[in-house]
């Protein structure tokens, strides 16, 4: 019998605003799943090692996974 | 400016019904989180319910779970409270309060606030 | 769930510092923040995290922490600073928020 699990979403609120990706230390993209029906992004600062929860559907934001994964495929061999 | 406004504060008979709401201006209103938060005569604040900025979170003290609930329409930025089966101890002035930035564990922080409704559970 | 725990009353002397602490097992996981109440106003958040003002808020006002208890300080406290003082923060053990049982501070 599978377990009944409820909703278990992380961000209680989101940002809209840009993130320098340099000042990045994690990046952590979560898809929706049947424990919660929203894409979640939750950043990690290198300063004092904040996270921010950031709206997935704001401009600034997918500016930002482009150039996060720009940034990576340029260091994958 | 930030501003929160309750309203449907009033009188009601204990085991009635009442729903208050928080109509929210000066900020993009459907990014925030939102709680209400109460105070009794004479005792302290006591938190009652928190709402992520979609609806999709709910989170609710003890006391009120069962008998509260908390939504919001984002549409017309306005955070509710539909509070049944009232009892005399649910009497208090009511706050809506905005969450305090986006990180997901300090949802806590509490940095705008309503001047909150009073709502009176008597026979 | 856990509780926050606050002296009930504290008194200052016009232009002295004092201490208002905030004792709970969840401060040893989250830090605290603090709230003003003035009488007939709405609740005010005067410090969060670490030690963090919001804008408009006098430097007199700051905080700290150590092991399970918060402590919000005012050096050099003012009339206008007479008020009920509340700290909150969430339990560890789930997602309830949590509010001390305020302080009620009077300025001398």
């Known amino acids: 019998v599978p377990l009944s699990r409820t909703v278990r979403c992380t961000c209680i609120s989101i940002s809209n605003q840009p993130v320098n990706p340099r000042s990045l230390e994690k990046l952590e993209i979560i898809p929706a799943s049947q424990f919660c029906p929203r894409v979640e992004i939750i950043a990690t600062m290198k300063k004092k090692g904040e996270k921010r929860c950031l709206n997935p559907e704001s401009k600034a934001i997918k500016n930002l996974l482009k150039a996060v994964s720009k940034e990576r495929s340029k260091r994958s061999p | 400016q930030v501003q929160l406004v309750e309203s449907g504060g009033g009188v009601v008979r204990p085991g009635r019904s009442l729903r208050l709401s928080c109509a929210a201006s000066g900020f993009t209103f459907s990014s925030y989180g939102m709680h209400w938060v109460r105070q009794a005569p004479g005792k302290g604040l006591e938190w009652v319910a928190v709402?992520?900025?979609?609806?999709?979170?709910?989170y609710y003290a003890d006391s009120v779970k069962g008998r509260f609930t908390i939504s919001r329409d984002n549409s017309k930025n306005t955070l509710y409270l539909q509070m049944n089966s009232l009892r005399a101890e649910d009497t208090a002035i009511y706050y809506c309060?905005?969450?305090?930035?986006?990180?997901?564990?300090?949802?806590?922080?509490?940095?705008?606030w309503g001047k909150g409704t009073l709502v009176t559970v008597s026979s | 769930s856990s509780e926050l725990t606050q002296d009930p009353a504290v008194s200052v002397a016009l232009g002295q510092t004092v201490r208002i602490t905030c004792q709970g097992d969840s401060l040893r996981s989250y830090y605290a923040s603090w709230y003003q109440r003035k009488p007939g106003q709405a609740p005010v958040l005067v410090i969060y995290?670490?030690?963090n003002r919001p804008s408009g808020i006098p430097d007199r006002f700051s905080g700290s922490s150590s092991g399970n208890t918060a402590s919000l300080t005012i050096t050099g406290a003012q009339a206008e600073d007479e008020a009920d003082y509340y700290c909150?923060?969430?339990?560890?053990?789930?997602?309830?928020?949590?509010f001390g049982g305020g302080t009620k501070l009077t300025v001398l």
């Open positions: 309060a905005r969450v305090m930035g986006t990180d997901p564990h300090s949802y806590y922080y509490m940095d705008v």
């Open positions: 995290g670490k030690n």
């Open positions: 709402i992520s900025y979609d609806g999709s979170i709910k």
């Open positions: 909150n923060s969430r339990d560890s053990s789930g997602n309830h928020v949590l």
